[in-house]
Amino acid sequence: MKVLQEPTCVSDYMSISTCEWKMNGPTNCSTELRLLYQLVFLLSEAHTCIPENNGGAGCVCHLLMDDVVSADNYTLDLWAGQQLLWKGSFKPSEHVKPRAPGNLTVHTNVSDTLLLTWSNPYPPDNYLYNHLTYAVNIWSENDPADFRIYNVTYLEPSLRIAASTLKSGISYRARVRAWAQCYNTTWSEWSPSTKWHNSYREPFEQ
């Protein structure tokens, strides 16, 4: 049994880091493998992660961590029974993938304006709380070419757009994702999408 693709890990900068790797053949990850991880810090204790299958030869493990800061560095040991398959390290602050925003809502009761709001996925005491920016994706269910991205570079988790910038009388969907420039993070996953029917009064033409 060998590791074909070494583990790569990303942190949500809150409580979970996710590591993925591939074995050289079909593997029952949860019964055959264990990923041990330990913070390089005085008094820290080793923890064991039981991986799950992620495709035939792929494995994924969700590592539980406390508050993450730049100083944190973890040793990682991948074991198959008594055999050490791979040894490495992981610095969560250098591999951050933010949590996806939630509770995306489209408010259509404002006159001819669409107000999209969502929730910041972090609590106020987390460093990323005040450092997220967002991308909002809006697309038409009827017309695949009607697909647009709005970059939200301010802190407030909301976006206002004129309803008239979208076609009237058809259904649209929206989703939102986040990233943080301060840590040069990857983009989060998209939030679940929300659907609404866009209708507004056309301006009266003489």
Epitope: F41, D66, D67, V69, S70, A71
Partner: antibody
Framework: QVQLVQSGAEVKKPGASVKVSCKAS????????MHWARQAPGQGLEWMGI????????SYAQKFQGRVTMTRDTSTSTVYMELSSLRSEDTAVYYC?????????WGKGTLVTVSS | QSVLTQPPSVSAAPGQKVTISCSGG????????VSWYQQLPGTAPKLLIY???KRPSGIPDRFSGSKSGTSATLAITGLQTGDEADYYC????????????FGTGTKLTVL
């Protein structure tokens, strides 16, 4: 919110021992390390040691090795710092502080006076 | 005896900017991260800066931290009378057991 409530002021004679308590609330007690530091009157901060409330393991500053003992009671989310063989130079405010690399939250401090 | 050296005192007028230095060595600041603590008169210390330059929630952006080599600096802009306090830098000793260490402390007086 996070709160660290320390026991009240103590007056001790040289050679005696003192045990200061620090009751934690507002977070998962066993998930965060607890440090102890002290500050003599008009002096700076001095780190004394750290305890991992999860397993109870400890690490002490060399200066206090053999004189200090840190323990915890997970049932009451309380950590204790006991300092023995007290001398007048141990007169100080003793602080517990939650954190790992950084000391995020501090107790209000416990004044220990050593006087004959 | 702290191995992190700070000036004993600094002073400036309200509205001005002040900096406080913290000098260490390769086995502490040079190979780790720096924090800063504010201790108002008669109170416990409070974390002001961690990871060299990050502020915990609730700390105004008038406070900023930086690190270069084996030294670190705390800068306070738009000085207010309420900023009058003792300030301590902190890091840990990488040569032994990662034990935390504090600076000697700096008394800030707002004139």
């Amino acid at each position: 919110q996070v709160q660290l409530v320390q026991s009240g002021a103590e007056v001790k004679k040289p050679g005696a021992s003192v045990k200061v308590s620090c009751k934690a609330s507002g977070y998962a007690f066993t998930s965060y390390y607890m440090h102890w530091a002290r500050q003599a009157p008009g002096q700076g901060l001095e780190w004394m040691g750290i305890i991992n409330p999860s397993g109870g393991s400890t690490s002490y500053a060399q200066k206090f090795q053999g004189r200090v003992t840190m323990t915890r009671d997970t049932s009451t989310s309380t950590v204790y710092m006991e300092l023995s063989s007290l001398r007048s130079e141990d007169t100080a405010v003793y602080y517990c502080a939650r954190g790992k690399w950084w000391l995020y939250n501090w107790g209000k401090g416990t004044l220990v006076t050593v006087s004959s | 005896q702290s191995v992190l050296t700070q000036p004993p005192s600094v002073s400036a007028a309200p509205g001005q900017k002040v900096t406080i230095s913290c000098s260490g060595g390769s086995s502490n600041i040079g190979n780790s991260y720096v924090s800063w603590y504010q201790q108002l008169p008669g109170t416990a210390p409070k974390l002001l800066i961690y990871d060299n330059n990050k502020r915990p929630s609730g700390i105004p952006d008038r406070f900023s931290g930086s690190k270069s080599g084996t030294s670190a600096t705390l800068a306070i802009t738009g000085l207010q009378t309420g900023d009058e306090a003792d300030y301590y830098c902190g890091t840990w000793d990488t040569s032994t057991t990662y034990h935390p260490i504090f600076g000697t402390g700096t008394k800030l007086t707002v004139l």
